[in-house]
Interface confidence: low
């Protein structure tokens, strides 16, 4: 089969909105199924027409009623012939129209009176394309070739900019870009002390409005009373909007406040948030833990622990922990310095320890007391010592 595009030059230039008819001549086939292809894809949704010139000579037409820029491309026709695909020479269709924007001015946020640039680019065909800039409803300067960059020395209020592209076919207007003024950020909010220990505090907060400029850091200020002497000031990069305060004094009342900064400067401080560090756990272990075996069980006694530092606060209750060879174990809490142990197996060795607790937690464990299964009583010593008499 012979195949060729007829009635069209290698390059065909058409104005946007105008009709185009491409034709394809096929010889040596009866009623060929002519397929039109554009840029490698079969054209299925456009009008196609077949004209039989003779029994073995057909002309197929591809009719584009009103061409748009998207119709531009490389067209050819193809037919199936004995399992082979015959492909014609291509025709390049160029669609001329008003300029088409490839780059439009983007919204910006800038500091007051700071210089900035806006870009605009449009293409034909036809070329050349010239650009005219608008500031609000005022034209700025004369036409410039595309692409164009507008240099603005600064603005003192939010301002609208757009560009207009011109070629021989007419003009097109870009989107309107709004140039916003950057400002100081708003104060942070929802400030929360998320974790507390005797010397550390974790703080989290939500940033306020960033003033259209990236938040760079936040400052956490700590005092021992609102408005008192600054104990600590920590500057943290953000995000995340969290901070760990270290080296605080146990069992102490503090207040903190937070502010955040962007390139223009810091926000106001948020309101003071009070918090209190936890006290210290007891530093001492109960001494002289001993056991007295009775008919009803085992009585354990130890010496009272006296607070070593005021930060430990009031002490008590005591926590007793015991374990036996058979794996049985238990804990009990008692208010005084004496406990009656029940539920243990006298036939098995017993190891007992005691500690004193406060609001923070338990202090160090006492030396373990070993009560041997054949002892009538026990005494403190290494875990494996046996006492008998």
């Amino acid at each position: 089969a012979g195949l060729k595009l007829m009635g069209a030059p290698v390059k065909l230039t058409v104005s946007q909105g105008q009709p185009v008819k491409l034709n394809c001549s096929v010889e040596g086939m009866e009623e060929p199924d002519i397929q039109w292809v554009k840029d490698g894809a079969v054209v299925q949704n456009l009008d196609q027409l077949y004209i039989p010139v003779s029994e073995q000579h057909w002309i197929g037409f591809l009719s584009l009623k009103s061409v748009e820029r998207s119709d531009a491309g490389r067209y050819w026709c193809q037919v199936e012939d004995g399992g082979e695909t015959e492909i014609s020479q291509p025709v390049w269709l160029t669609v001329e129209g008003v300029p088409f924007f490839t780059v439009e001015p983007k919204d910006l946020a800038v500091p007051p009176n700071a210089p900035f640039q806006l870009s605009c680019e449009a293409v034909g065909p036809p070329e050349p394309v010239t650009i005219v800039w608008w500031r609000g409803t005022t034209k700025i300067g004369g036409p410039a070739p595309s692409p164009s960059v507008l240099n603005v020395t600064g603005v003192t209020q939010s301002t609208m900019f757009s560009c207009e592209a011109h070629n021989l076919k007419g003009l097109a207007s870009s989107r309107t870009a709004t140039v916003h003024l950057q400002a100081l950020p708003a104060a942070p909010f929802n400030i929360t002390v998320t974790k507390l220990s005797s010397s550390n505090a974790s703080v989290a907060w939500m940033p306020g409005a960033d003033g259209r400029a990236l938040l760079q850091s936040c400052t956490v200020q700590v005092t021992q009373a609102p408005g008192g002497w600054e104990v600590l000031a920590v500057v943290v990069p953000v995000p995340p909007f969290t901070c760990l305060l270290r080296d605080l004094v146990p069992a102490t009342n503090y207040s903190l406040r937070v502010r955040c900064a962007n390139a223009l400067g810091p926000s106001p401080y948020a309101d003071w948030v009070p918090f209190q560090t936890k006290g210290l756990a007891p530093a001492s272990a109960p001494q002289n833990l001993h056991a007295i075996r009775t008919d009803s069980g085992l009585i354990l006694e130890w010496e009272e622990v006296i607070p070593e530092a005021p930060l430990e606060g009031p002490l008590g209750p005591y926590k007793l922990s015991w374990v036996q060879d058979n794996g049985t174990q238990d804990e009990l809490t008692v208010e005084g310095t004496r406990a009656n142990l029940t539920g243990w197996d006298p036939q098995k060795d017993l190891i007992v320890r005691v500690c004193v607790s406060n609001a923070v937690g338990c202090g160090p464990w006492s030396q373990p007391l070993v009560v041997s299964s054949h002892d009538r009583a026990g005494q403190q010593g290494p875990p494996h010592s046996r006492t008998s008499w």
Partner: antibody, heavy 125, light 108 residues
Framework: EVQLVQSGADVKKPGASLTISCQAS????????ISWVRQKPGKGLEWMGR????????YYGPSFQGHVTISADRSTATAYLQWRSLEASDTAMYYC??????????????????WGPGTLVTVSS | SYELTQPPSVSVSPGQTARITCSGD??????AYWYQQKSGQAPVLVIY???KRASGIPERFSGSSSGTMATLTISGAQVEDEADYYC???????????FGGGTKLTVL
């Protein structure tokens, strides 16, 4: 003057992703197709694929279908060749080529007159 | 997949005629193109559409095609013609391109 400027040589580990680029100048980017050609060290040329002038249509050689992605950015007149997961066998020089040339007989798509300098990709663990 | 077959090497003396062949089932319906690649350089188009010389290519280079065979001929080969030569065409369905395996031309 037609110029195809390719990105620099790259060394990657197997399994890594990679995108190499080819920036065209000296002609209207959307008037021509861009093809990519591979050449392994000491071996012959292999046609990898081609992207249409407007970036809407891509063709791939059977050996490369599904392994690489060809794309283009009309605004920067740049074509790209991308791998999601490199293999040691991808070690090669990669050329981008302007596909299509104007001749007395018309525009010939497979007229590969303008070649980039090549990008050497080395994939090694 | 579609293949184009070339001889791995061809040797000629300076001034002699070198012929490099390329065979492929679709060559009766598809054009052949020839590319020259010198060591360490990008390929250069020599012949397009079977027999047309690309711009800037000396007249001693010519191409022909008959049936399933395309041929690149260098009449009066010169030392500077020593290079790898690749034929190129498109698949029978026209949906992908194919290079031949390449022929190393040695001009002794």
């Amino acid at each position: 003057e037609v110029q195809l400027v390719q990105s620099g040589a790259d060394v990657k580990k197997p399994g890594a992703s990679l995108t190499i680029s080819c920036q065209a100048s000296g002609y209207t980017f959307t008037d021509y197709w861009i093809s990519w050609v591979r050449q392994k060290p000491g071996k012959g040329l292999e046609w990898m694929g081609r992207i249409s002038r407007h970036g809407s249509q891509t063709y791939y050689g059977p050996s490369f279908q599904g392994h690489v992605t060809i794309s283009a950015d009309r605004s920067t007149a740049t074509a790209y060749l991308q791998w999601r997961s490199l293999e040691a066998s991808d070690t090669a020089m990669y050329y981008c080529v302007r596909a299509g040339g104007q001749t007395s007989g018309g525009t010939i798509p497979e007229y590969y007159q303008h070649w980039g300098p090549g990008t050497l990709v080395t994939v090694s663990s | 997949s579609y293949e184009l077959t070339q001889p791995p090497s061809v040797s000629v003396s300076p001034g002699q005629t070198a012929r490099i062949t390329c065979s492929g089932d679709a060559l009766p319906k598809k054009y052949a193109y020839w590319y020259q690649q010198k060591s360490g350089q990008a390929p250069v188009l020599v012949i397009y559409e079977d027999h047309k010389r690309a711009s800037g290519i000396p007249e001693r280079f010519s191409g022909s095609s008959s049936g399933t065979m395309a041929t690149l001929t260098i009449s009066g080969a010169q030392v500077e013609d020593e290079a790898d030569y690749y034929c190129y065409s498109i698949s029978p369905a026209g949906n992908y391109g194919v290079f031949g395996g390449g022929t190393k031309l040695t001009v002794l």
